[in-house]
Structure formats: structure tokens, C-alpha cells
Amino acid sequence: GQNITARIGEPLVLSCKGAPKKPPQQLEWKLNTGRTEAWKVLSPQGGPWDSVARILPNGSLLLPATGIVDEGTFRCRATNRRGKEVKSNYRVRVYQIPGKPEIVDPASELTASVPNKVGTCVSEGSYPAGTLSWHLDGKLLIPDGKETLVKEETRRHPETGLFTLRSELTVIPTQGGTHPTFSCSFSLGLPRRRPLNTAPIQLRVREPGPPEGIQLLVEPEGGIVAPGGTVTLTCAISAQPPPQVHWIKDGAPLPLAPSPVLLLPEVGHEDEGTYSCVATHPSHGPQESPPVSIRVTETGDEGPAEGSVGESGLGTLA
């Protein structure tokens, strides 16, 4: 048999070998596709199937607009002028080229030695699904699960049957000061079909530096709260990726899960003390915030205590 590849929505003509070019013709077309459950023999007189597969006067079969459901096998059996039976057999596959792939949510820069999301490559409207590949400086990037990580997702449109592919690239650059170029390409995997490429993105890789600052914000401002009130301490760090944050009270670590927010509900005198947060970043050591003092007292009977953060409500470590 012969393999035929047809573009979705385009017409396709399959010739019936051996069939006389004009009637009278002795021929039979049958098909087994997504529109049938077994072999369907087409009536030479035409009928309701003509909208999807029609026998032409010369004996060829016309598919006016091929669809996904037209994938399958088409066979013609004809008797030629000399009375010999001639068979034609076609295996039809369909395809649809998607729109140009795009890198969405691209990173603005990368940090060496830590995982960075480069961006997400998206291709919409392909059939069959095809594949997305990432390239670094023009060379194919092979995911290793460590320095190069690719997360893929394939979705099929419920009505059109066409595919949307998404590929998210995460890398750990080894050193700063470089300017790698990333691109993504879509391939249908069909012969004679060139891949579709995204516009490349060039990113700067910077060395991981210490976080620019660590701030401890306290609510209510001044750290003075009435008994039964609530205190919220927030550790604000500008580092990427966000570090783990632990809490210290009066010099001792608090046995709590790491969190950038510490909530003290229904405070009592036992909650009084000096609090600070410690941020632990993978690329450099722990960093501690300036302390804040929490006082539990009836409102208005005292001013800010010594060592509190005063009116501003925050302490900053340069």
C-alpha cells in the first residue's frame, strides 16, 4: 500500500489504479477510518458520504476537506479494460502545522548555581501532537533532570482534536558573567517538514550575591500590644529563590516550621521578648534580621520600650 499524508482541511484525491477514465467503470471504493467502525463501501451513485468522500467520474476518490477522522485505510478494486482486477491501497495520515511557537513568561536574567525558570514554550494547534525541543546557543539541550529540567504538558482541544504543547525549562547555570541564548523549536516529526523556531531570548547570568536586605516588619507598629491581641511578624527578603526563614526569640530558635510570617494570636505576657528572623540561602550562609521587641501591656500606658523598632515598624540590615 501507499502512505499518504494530507493537511487537515485540504482536499485529497486518491486514484483508482486500472479504472477506465470514463464510465462504464467496474470499481468499488471502500474505507476504514474514524468515521466507520468497519469497512464502508461507497455507492458509485453517490449519497450522504459524498460530503466526506466522493467518487469522481474518472474513478478517483475525492476527500473535499480531510479531517482527523479521515485517517485510515482506503481501498479501490477496479476491473480494467482487459478484464483484469487491479487493487489500490492507501494509508492516509493527516497533519496540521501549528502557529509559530512562543516563549511565554521569559526570565529577565538568571542567577548562577541556583535553579532558574527560563520560560515556557507554547505551541498551539498541531496534529499529531509533535514535540517541543529547547536549544542553548543553537545546540539541542538534553534534559538531565539536574542542571537542565523540562516540564512538559500536552492538551487536546475537545472539539477540533488539535494539540497544545507546553514545555517549561529550568536550568542551573554554572557560572556568572555569561549571556546564553535560549530558543525553542516545534517538530511534527514528518518527513520534509522543517521545525518551527521561536525567537531566541538572550539572558544575562549573574553571580549569586547576598540578599540586598532583610527587614522585619511588626504589626502593630512599635511592637506594643494589649493582652489577647495579635502580633504579626513578617520577614521580608529580596533574595531569589526565596530562602527558608526561621525565628528566634530571646536568642533561642523557636520550634516552628520555616515561614516568612510569624503569627502570635491572643498574646500574653509569656510572649513578650526580643524576636528576630534568620534567612538561610542555599548559596551563602544564614542572615539574621535586626531584632524587634514585643511588649504586652494595656494600651497607652507606656511609650516604645528600649530596643524596639520605634515608630517605623521595621528594622533594616544593609
Partner: antibody, heavy 119, light 107 residues
């Protein structure tokens, strides 16, 4: 909203002719096959004719072949049925319906127009 | 030509009853069968397309099923507005063929 409105029915003598029309709206007319179906008084439904979306191919049952002609004007969103050599047994309500191929079957129908063949 | 043998030709039922109407095709017609409802003096209304699919705006008490060349329309709980005549149609081959109809009457 898909709408099909038939007209042109009436009383005609045996051997006479009549032309039915169907005005279509609410959909892209030239994307669909169109079909005429009839129903004799107190009887079931009977297929009369179908035409493909371009108007190039027409289909009839033996009972009306060579007497009836289905046609369409895609520019006017209109379907027609020319009925010649009418017989008493052609008396029926004639419905215009969208479809007639395997993609649609028959989905939307007009309200029908009555054709009476009697002397 | 394909014959569509519809049964029963009529039935009496009460509101709330489960009603089943069958069409048998004389040869394989695949999934290419529609079901219609027709009320006196009105045009047919499509209920089911391609044997099993519920048409837009049709209540979910209507369903279609297929076993080989046997096609079934089921009304799970008959409502007062369902008393009408029902037809099947095969559209796999010409001539397009309708079943003879089933008149559903109030018991």
C-alpha cells in the same frame, strides 16, 4: 437562530407544476447540504431530495426522480424544489431541512408548506 | 434500499413511565441514525444525532443507544409534553429512510 421558511405550496391539478422555496437564515447557508422531506396527511416522513452545499450534486429517490428538481441559490440563501408532472400521491406537507449528509443528518426543519394535488 | 423497521407503532403510557422505542436497520448503517419528535401540525424536532448524542436544548431524560443495527430511543420518565410521534432516520445511504413512526399516547 437557525430559521427555515417554506413557501409556494397550494392546490394544483394532476400533471401540473409547482415551485417551492425555502428561505434560510441564522447560519452559513453554503456550508450545508439541504434536503426536502414530505409527509402525506396522517402518514410518516418521506425523503424527497437533497443537494450538496455547492449545488453541483443532487440526489432523489426513485419516486420523484425525473419529475422533481432541487436547486439552490447560495447568494440568496434560498433552496428550491421544482415539481412537475404532479400526481395525487404527491399531496403532502413539504418540509425544508438543513443537512442530508453524514456530517449532519437532518437537524433543523422549516414549518412546512402544504401541496395538494387534486382535480 | 435500507429498511428502518420501527416498533411499536403506538404505545400508551403514563407520566413518569420509562418508554423505549426501537428501530432496526435492514443492513449496517454505522452510527448514522437520528431520532425526531413530532407533534400534530408541527415540524419534526431532532432529539438524538448519530445514534447516541443528545441534541442541543433536549432534556436529558431522552437518550439514544445502539447495538449493531438496532437503535433505541429511551425516555426515562415520560412528561406531559412528551406525548407525540417519534421517528428514526438513517442517513448512511440513499435513499434516506425514516422509520414508520411511534405514536406515544396517554394511558
Amino acid at each position: 437562530e437557525v430559521q427555515l421558511v417554506e413557501s409556494g405550496g397550494g392546490l394544483v391539478q394532476p400533471g401540473g407544476s409547482l415551485r417551492l422555496s425555502c428561505a434560510a437564515s441564522g447560519f452559513t447557508f453554503n456550508n450545508y447540504w439541504m434536503t426536502w422531506v414530505r409527509q402525506a396527511p396522517g402518514k410518516g416522513l418521506e425523503w424527497v431530495a437533497s443537494i450538496d452545499n455547492s449545488g453541483d450534486n443532487t440526489y432523489y429517490p426513485d419516486s420523484v426522480k425525473d419529475r422533481f428538481t432541487i436547486s439552490r441559490d447560495n447568494a440568496k440563501n434560498s433552496l428550491y424544489l421544482q415539481m412537475n408532472s404532479l400526481r395525487a400521491e404527491d399531496t403532502a406537507v413539504y418540509y425544508c431541512a438543513r443537512g442530508g449528509d453524514i456530517l449532519v443528518g437532518l437537524d433543523y426543519w422549516g414549518q412546512g408548506t402544504l401541496v395538494t394535488v387534486s382535480s | 434500499d435500507i429498511q428502518m423497521t420501527q416498533s411499536p407503532s403506538s404505545l400508551s403510557a403514563s407520566v413518569g413511565d420509562r418508554v423505549t422505542i426501537t428501530c432496526r436497520a435492514s443492513q449496517d448503517v454505522g452510527i448514522y441514525v437520528n431520532w425526531f419528535q413530532q407533534k400534530p401540525g408541527k415540524a419534526p424536532r431532532r432529539l438524538i444525532y448519530r445514534a447516541t448524542n443528545l441534541a442541543d436544548g433536549v432534556p436529558s431524560r431522552f437518550s439514544g443507544s445502539r447495538s449493531g443495527t438496532d437503535f433505541t430511543l429511551t425516555i426515562s420518565s415520560l412528561q406531559p409534553e412528551d406525548f407525540a410521534t417519534y421517528y428514526c432516520l438513517e442517513f448512511d445511504e440513499h435513499p434516506l429512510t425514516f422509520g414508520g413512526g411511534t405514536k406515544v399516547e396517554i394511558k
